[in-house]
Interface confidence: low
């Protein structure tokens, strides 16, 4: 056997030597095809000649009498040597234009060459093969392909890549999917479906590395193929908009004296768009800065959001601006696949200030007096001012926020608190202010899982209104679950605000969530009969804490306090 291998090697070197004297069309080392394979796994590598370099395929070459020869150079060696196709269990074999490893070993790393030749023709190309190790969580130096999924776009799939040709269609492999280290089973929105992994609705939390392990039998042996790819959740085309220029804008005037430095930032937001080229550029008097004689420098910075929306800032800078420069037109332009926009910066020359000392002093004194009066008025009437502003200028924060309820009311389940919630609070907030309340004992369906329903209601609500009383803090109550869920939601996602209403004074409590909540949140105190007064602070404070909502039923109550009729029955 050894003798036969020596003969083969000598014959092989004879081929290489004859090749040196004859011309061989050498395509060099094809570094574009940086092939990486995992140790101890099968690998099939097609000769790149037929894929990228030659106009004919292997069958045509073979039928024309051309022979495909393989050889390799070990890592950190210069010596070309034949590939040993006589290893036990045919570990390395060639089939048509494919080089097979069943399986690979770490020391198979090197540069592999396939040469197609006969007596008159020769063409060869080399490519690097790197055998890499992986740990138990599939981490390795392997370069991972990135698959982009659109956020909240409906069902999208990824497919286990590069497994074609390893086994015939009659073989049914087993496929296991992992996210990072964890096997994917019973995931909310990710479902393994054989070679595919389906994302029912892609969310930011789905970002990460996904691995499929394909196990298949061959000639009494079992092989594994491990393929990892990175999933990146990106902005959906449904939400994509043309570029938005945040600055320059109409509110900022760049007022400079000659000789000062002029700095104008152009800040542009680009929605993520697959394969879109985002561009930002300045023009000065309609020309590119390069085409004019001013000494202009432009510095660019780029930042990306979690969904790969992009914000580009280009700062146009003129070190010593002249009067002429201050008369020019500075326009920032932006373009993406969604469209092109432009915005001019407002640039003007600063007019030197006249020196009117007495007038200035009087003006300053009057201003200070006015500010003092305004501060006093604000301190006395701030609640009324806030409510007046919201009634006339506030934007409705309930539109398109995906929430079903304005307020989820959390309270201790006993007669007194229930009366306060169901009659007083509900009567005023629903009937008078037009808010939609979620009261668990009223709105939940019988037979549901209490924990799940509670969490679901809280997620559907804009505010969590906690009615504090000594009974509230008893361990293990439904009310405490509601408080914990609301605070967790507020801290982690910021999509619910918690309002504390003290119905009855609570002595020192051991409930750490409540302690923490009381230190960071304002507590609105119910003072019994005194609080029933329509123009009282309690209802005004409560209104300020509520979501801004344009409702036809809130016409007068915002300015007048509450109509007394609504409280007569309370």
């Amino acid at each position: 056997m050894t003798l036969l291998w020596c003969v083969v090697s000598l014959y092989f070197y004879g081929i290489l030597q004859s090749d040196a004297s004859e011309r061989c069309d050498d395509w060099g080392l094809d570094t574009m095809r940086q092939i990486q394979v995992f140790e101890d796994e099968p690998a099939r590598i097609k000769c790149p000649l037929f894929e990228h370099f030659l106009k004919f395929n292997y069958s045509t070459a073979h039928s024309a009498g051309l022979t495909l020869i393989w050889y390799w150079t070990r890592q950190d060696r210069d010596l070309e040597e034949p590939i040993n196709f006589r290893l036990p269990e045919n570990r390395i074999s060639k089939e048509k234009d494919v080089l097979w490893f069943r399986p690979t070993l770490l020391n198979d790393t090197g540069n592999y060459t396939c040469m197609l030749r006969n007596t008159t023709y020769c063409s060869k190309v080399a490519f690097p093969l790197e055998v890499v190790q992986k740990d138990s969580c599939f981490n390795s130096p392997m370069k991972l392909p990135v698959h982009k999924l659109y956020i909240e776009y409906g069902i999208q799939r990824i497919t286990c890549p590069n497994v074609d040709g390893y086994f015939p269609s009659s073989v049914k492999p087993t496929i296991t999917w992992y996210m990072g280290c964890y096997k994917i089973q019973n995931f909310n929105n990710v479902i393994p479906e054989g070679m595919n992994l389906s994302f029912l609705i892609a969310l930011i939390s789905n970002n990460g590395n996904y691995t499929c392990v394909v196990t298949y039998p061959e000639n009494g042996r079992t092989f594994h193929l491990t393929r990892t790819l990175t999933v990146k959740v990106v902005g959906s085309p449904k939400n994509a908009v043309p570029p938005v220029i945040h600055s320059p804008n109409d509110h900022v005037v760049y007022e400079k004296e000659p000789g000062e430095e002029l700095l104008i930032p152009c800040t542009v937001y680009f929605s993520f768009l697959m394969d879109s080229r985002n561009e930002v550029w300045w023009t000065i008097d309609g020309k590119k800065p390069d085409d004019i004689t001013i000494d202009v420098t432009i510095n660019e910075s780029i930042s990306h959001s979690r969904t790969e929306d992009e914000t580009r800032t280009q700062i146009l800078s003129i070190k010593k601006v002249t009067s002429e420069d201050l008369k020019r037109s500075y326009v920032c332009h932006a373009r993406s696949a969604k469209g092109e926009v432009a915005k001019a910066a407002k640039v003007k020359q600063k007019v030197p200030a006249p020196r009117y000392t007495v007038e200035l002093a009087c003006g300053f004194g009057a201003t200070v007096l006015l500010v003092v009066i305004l501060i006093v008025v604000y301190h006395v009437y701030w609640l009324e001012m806030v409510l007046f502003y919201r009634a006339h200028f506030g934007t409705d924060e309930t539109i398109l926020d995906g929430k079903e309820y304005d307020i989820y009311v959390s309270y201790a389940r006993n007669a007194e608190e229930e009366e306060f919630v169901l009659l007083t609070l509900r009567g005023v907030l629903e009937n008078e202010f037009g808010y939609k309340l979620c009261i668990f004992d009223r709105d939940s369906l019988p037979g549901g899982i209490v924990t799940d329903e509670t969490l679901s209601f809280i997620q559907k609500s804009r505010r969590l209104l906690v009615v504090l009383s000594p009974n509230y803090v008893l361990q293990g109550t439904q009310a405490l679950l509601e408080l914990k869920a609301g605070l967790e939601n507020m801290a982690s996602r910021g999509n619910i605000n918690v309002i504390l209403v003290q119905y009855k004074a609570v002595k020192e409590t051991k409930v750490k969530e409540l302690k923490r909540a009381k230190t960071v949140l304002t507590v609105i105190k119910w003072k019994g009969e005194k609080s029933k007064y329509p123009q009282g602070r309690f209802w005004k404070q409560l209104q300020v804490a509520m979501p801004v909502k344009k409702s036809p039923r809130r016409s007068s109550s915002d300015e007048q306090g509450l109509s007394y009729s609504s409280l007569k029955n309370v």
Partner: antibody
Framework: EVQLVESGGGLVQPGGSLRLSCAAS????????MTWVRQAPGKGLEWVAN????????NFVDSVKGRFTISRDNAKKSVFLQMNSLRAEDTAVYYC?????FGSGYFDYWGQGTLVTVSS | DIQMTQSPSTLSASVGDRVTITCRAS??????LAWYQQKPGKAPKLLIY???SLESGVPSRFSGSGSGTEFTLTISSLQPDDFATYYC?????????FGQGTKLEIK
Amino acid sequence: EVQLVESGGGLVQPGGSLRLSCAASGFTLSFYWMTWVRQAPGKGLEWVANIKQDGNEKNFVDSVKGRFTISRDNAKKSVFLQMNSLRAEDTAVYYCAREGYFGSGYFDYWGQGTLVTVSS
Amino acid sequence: DIQMTQSPSTLSASVGDRVTITCRASQSINSWLAWYQQKPGKAPKLLIYKASSLESGVPSRFSGSGSGTEFTLTISSLQPDDFATYYCQQYNSYPHTFGQGTKLEIK
């Protein structure tokens, strides 16, 4: 992003010369055959010449043989078409194009073109 | 030189139509044929190579078929963006030659 930008076109008298340049970016020029294709005003496309990765093999359409030469400078990421003894029938938009997959003969990326006008 | 003949020279069709453009080679070119789309004032754009392989990024409504001397480009359902001039090109032997073009216009 792959980009090809032609330059050097213009008005020239019959018998005159012109040198077109093609600046390549976004890919490794030394891996690809490069081609010039032209299009006379209102007419179809005509393949003119191509050049191998290392510049050692060049091909021309019969009508320009002996008058046009093609060259490349991989370090400067540029391809050139030197046009001598120009004739009126050489008037066209000249496109620089990259041959897909290392000399396969079809063109996967094109420049925007540069207009050459031969007229007295 | 290999002559490439396209037919028809002009084709009128409506949005949603299925259209076919034919390209004939004066001798066999195996499968070494490409199809391009060109709009006025723009550079051509590769659609199909090796007679039937779809270039990446090209909509799947475009398809190519044929081998030897007869080739076709099919657009399964015309879109407003598809009205342009289409060229076939052989790259079996030098000089590489193009067809004279087929102008696809709105009916």
